[in-house]
Amino acid sequence: EEELQVIQPDKSVSVAAGESAILHCTVTSLIPVGPIQWFRGAGPARELIYNQKEGHFPRVTTVSESTKRENMDFSISISNITPADAGTYYCVKFRKGSPDTEFKSGAGTELSVRAKPSAPVVSGPAARATPQHTVSFTCESHGFSPRDITLKWFKNGNELSDFQTNVDPVGESVSYSIHSTAKVVLTREDVHSQVICEVAHVTLQGDPLRGTANLSETIRVPPTLEVTQQPVRAENQVNVTCQVRKFYPQRLQLTWLENGNVSRTETASTVTENKDGTYNWMSWLLVNVSAHRDDVKLTCQVEHDGQPAVSKSHDLKVSA
């Protein structure tokens, strides 16, 4: 009688997360009698996956009719595979006894799990920055396997080159994470711009995942001010306007000063939007010239998005 052999024909099996993995195992003899057990890993720390005779293993089903006479097929199917199931699985024949003793092991089948990366999450700087400044964006994606992955950055469809990417951990793992930081130089036209992080992985069948960040959440475009005097509207009254142009975001407070004294404060409300996403706003002040003996210095002072105030002044001549 030839001695029993345990045959695991597949050296490796690759399965997508969520699917079932079939691990093949046959024996060449019914003798000695004793159960087949499946383990993940080898040595004293190995994990029992299935015991033909003892215990309940809800995720495991036998592929063949295992309670059939002369059954020598002990292949199993493991349902709902996750990256944590990756490893080398051994089909082991035990000899019946008290307790059962290990008789012979198969060569092992390495199970690798193909897991999709999570949707990339792009985050920008905590504080807004102004044009000509360089800001950093980060992109993170987790839970993918195998380790090979490609990450690209785009700004408005144009690929960026100034970025650094790390995949962790460096060694073997059930799943991996990617972290990338890109540097972007802001321009005044970036209110409508988008930064895109694109992740390509074998599990995505050529359809990469994208994460986006709107530069509108990052950029601050400071306003330009222009103060002009309008023709006299009525006797003793002068209309002075303050044009606040090309600012973003909308949060803006304007204060009129007459000879350094606060005349009026208002908040930008009915703004007009430019094509590039910035805003314009205009405020005017009616000055009663007859109330002044001397020339009047009018100042338009603007506080934009919590930043230090900027101002523009206009000298109003009062004729004797």
Partner: antibody, heavy 121, light 111 residues
């Protein structure tokens, strides 16, 4: 430690009914086929019935001498196997053993101590 | 049904000697190279105890002085050297097909 404990035997009149029970412990009951075998001085050891697993749809098989009169059943949640015996005859007298089939092959590796049924008027 | 005929019905063997029990089936109990024959030992007041499975394989915990052989329709149980505790009745049983049947038994006495 594997244990099989039968109960329910006793003295019955011909034509009567009786139910034998067997409680198992020390192993995963739901993974094993279970059998009843009886023994009498007249007939020696005689296989009576077999019940298979849930995955086998609890298939049952019977000796010709008891077919239609005896019913084997199991309750995996209680690790128990039963033998319902109707229309009892004198020749059903004997010790009834509850047995575990180790390898789906009438490999009777563990036997209970037995319960005695006497059918007599 | 497959009928199993055991012989002898009883035998007496001296301590340390060999006991040989035969079991003949009315039809082959062998398929695919496996011999579906089992041997049991029964002592008074106890249930039978499995000794040999698939004709020639020693059940776990059974002393090596018990051995089985045979194929097809003819099978043998050997006990050597016989010890006092081996005094019992021995049964063969087949699982070649349903229904499973047992031999009539062989009573072994130690001289």
């Amino acid at each position: 430690e594997v244990k099989l404990e039968e109960s329910g035997g006793g003295l019955m009149q011909p034509g009567g009914s009786m139910k034998l029970s067997c409680v198992a412990s020390g192993f995963t009951f739901s993974n094993y086929w279970m059998n009843w075998v009886r023994q009498s001085p007249e007939k020696g050891l005689e296989w009576v019935a077999e019940i298979r697993l849930k995955s086998n749809n609890y298939a049952t098989h019977y000796a010709e001498s008891v077919k239609g009169r005896f019913t084997i059943s199991r309750d995996d949640s209680k690790s128990s196997v039963y033998l319902q015996m109707n229309n009892l005859r004198a020749e059903d007298t004997g010790i009834y053993y509850c047995i575990r089939d180790y390898d789906y092959d009438a490999y009777f590796d563990y036997w209970g101590q037995g319960t005695t049924l006497t059918v007599s008027s | 049904d497959i009928v199993l005929t055991q012989s002898p019905a009883s035998l007496a063997v001296s301590l340390g000697q060999r006991a040989t029990i035969s079991c003949r089936a009315s039809k082959s109990v062998s398929t695919s190279g496996y011999n579906y024959m089992y041997w049991y030992q029964q002592k008074p007041g106890q249930p039978p105890k499995l000794l040999i499975y698939l004709a020639s394989n020693l059940e776990s915990g059974v002393p090596a002085r018990f051995s089985g052989s045979g194929s097809g329709t003819d099978f043998t149980l050997n006990i050597h050297p016989v010890e006092e505790e081996d005094a019992a009745t021995y049964y063969c049983q087949h699982s070649g097909e349903l229904p499973y049947t047992f031999g009539g038994g062989t009573k072994l006495e130690i001289k």
